[in-house]
């Protein structure tokens, strides 16, 4: 299932539309593109060109993160005169041309979305051979990944003063929500850090101080669903060891 | 960290050939057009080809139409020219370099010294 | 071809002073807006050309902020404040709109 947000302000589509005397070229991306982790995702793209009938050599890009610069996910050409945009990238795999870019249309589709995914991607289209010519999306598209929580890291560290931390990573898009329960515990939020700079979607919480033996579990909720894991302390009483 | 290295270049006579190569290193290769820019003693720049990101489009300036070759070998990320019909114009120094489009000629190789002369 | 015509040929500068380089093109070199195909590259002796300015007024990776491009279709200037030593050598523009790709013939920059 994929959602194309509309902006009002545009109408459905961001389109940057860039003409002089001579020349007209514009793009045609919507602002946002929604999926779910997991699944396909189309990313649209159509433009128009001053350059009436071209039947040249053309280069179709995906790029990914920033325009112009960022880095290529997808790329195909096609020969004078052909239909068929050959494949030469496609990251993971997981990209292929769904448009056809000789009837201007460079649509994308995305398969098996992963968290990754969730960035700004721009379409750009290259002329060559008698005109020799380029235009790319400066706005892009911006793909938005959901994904129910998964918890990728739960674990007990020791501390100062021979005592034990529970730490608790989580990953989703809503953030999930995160909370500890155990021994004497309830239900407790422990110190949820913010997601760490480019690990927007990874949140950690943290239990400081383990003062009883048990099992502690760790809860992540989002609006698409829940995930728990559990770890277990056991100290050796009398020892400073533990078991977990 | 970006790197472009020439072979060597050297002393030709007019009307032979010599074939320069660049070994490139520290980024997606074929990500990228390449292009050779060439600059007579104590003169400016002057572009000469570039080559698209397949090696499936050159482009090269009037002056070396039919006599000189670009080519890329993505496998290796090495470019080449190839040079034939020298002539004693041709005397440079040659320079691989990345061409980013938007971004210009945005690294640049050591260059190479072509000498044409009998 | 696009010619891009340089002024001066050379300029002397004190250290510490202000220099401007200008750069002209025989047809627009604006694509669409926001997107102008000129460049602006510094060959200091014995080295190979840098890139110092894209895209008319973008700072290169590693260039200082004294060094300031700016105009529009036809008409463009590199503007160095604060000259220092380092930044002796042969300053070039260059556009990237049309094949052929050209430069300008180059100005020389000398501390006095």
């Known amino acids: 299932f994929v959602r194309t947000k509309i902006d009002t302000t545009e109408n459905l589509l961001n389109t940057e539309v860039h003409s002089s005397p001579a020349q007209r070229w514009s793009m045609q991306v919507p602002p946002e593109v929604s999926a779910e982790a997991g699944d396909a995702a189309v990313l649209p793209c159509t433009f128009t060109h001053p350059h009436r009938h071209y039947d040249g050599p053309l280069t179709a890009i995906w790029r990914a993160g920033e325009p112009y610069a960022g880095p290529q996910v997808f790329r195909c050409a096609a020969a004078r005169g052909s239909e068929l945009c050959q494949t030469a990238l496609s990251l993971h795999g997981r990209f292929r041309l769904l448009g056809n870019p000789r009837r201007n249309d460079l649509s994308l589709r995305v398969e098996r979305l992963a968290l990754a995914d969730d960035r700004r991607y721009f379409c750009r289209v290259e002329f060559a051979g008698d005109v020799h010519d380029r235009y790319e999306s400066r706005h892009g598209v911006r793909l938005h990944v959901t994904a129910a929580p998964r918890i990728v890291n739960i674990s007990v560290l020791p501390s100062p003063a021979h005592a034990f931390r529970a730490l608790c990573t989580a990953e989703g898009e809503p953030p999930p929500a995160l909370a500890w329960s155990g021994p004497a515990l309830g239900n407790s939020l422990a110190a949820v850090r913010s997601p760490r700079e480019g690990h927007g979607h990874l949140v950690t919480a943290e239990l400081p101080a383990l003062t009883h033996d048990g099992r502690y579990t760790c809860t992540a909720a989002n609006s698409l669903g829940r995930s728990e894991a559990s770890v277990y302390l056991f100290r050796f009483h009398g020892a400073s060891g533990a078991s977990t | 960290e970006v790197q472009l290295v020439e072979s060597d270049g050297g002393l030709v006579q007019p009307g032979r050939s010599l074939k320069l190569s660049c070994a490139a290193s520290?980024?997606?290769?074929?990500?990228?057009?390449l292009a050779w820019v060439r600059q007579a003693p104590t003169k400016g720049l002057e572009w000469v080809a570039s080559?698209?990101?397949?090696?499936?489009?050159?482009y090269y300036r009037d002056s070396v139409k039919g006599r000189f070759t670009i080519s890329r070998d993505n496998a290796k990320s090495t470019l080449s020219l190839q040079m034939d019909s020298l002539r004693s114009e041709d005397t440079a120094t040659y320079y691989c370099?990345?061409?980013?489009?938007?971004?210009?000629?945005?690294?640049w190789g050591q260059g190479t010294l072509v000498t044409v002369s009998s | 071809d696009i010619v891009m015509t340089q002024t001066p040929l050379s300029l002397s500068v004190t250290p510490g002073a202000s220099a401007s380089i200008s750069c002209r093109s025989s047809?627009?070199?604006?694509?669409?807006?926001?997107?102008?195909?000129v460049f602006w590259y510094l060959q200091k002796p014995g080295r190979s050309p840098r890139l110092l300015i894209y895209?008319?007024?973008n700072l290169a990776s590693g260039v200082p902020d004294r060094f300031r491009g700016s105009g529009s279709e036809t008409d463009f200037t590199l503007k160095i404040s604060r000259v220092e030593a380092e930044d002796v050598g042969i300053y070039y523009c260059?556009?990237?709109?049309?094949?052929?790709?050209?430069f300008g013939s180059g100005t020389k920059l000398e501390i006095k």
């Open positions: 370099a990345r061409q980013d489009w938007e971004g210009g000629f945005a690294y």
């Open positions: 520290g980024f997606t290769f074929s990500d990228y057009y």
């Open positions: 080559v698209s990101y397949q090696g499936i489009t050159n």
């Open positions: 047809k627009s070199l604006l694509h669409s807006p926001g997107l102008t195909y």
């Open positions: 895209r008319v007024s």
């Open positions: 260059g556009q990237l709109l049309e094949n052929p790709f050209t």
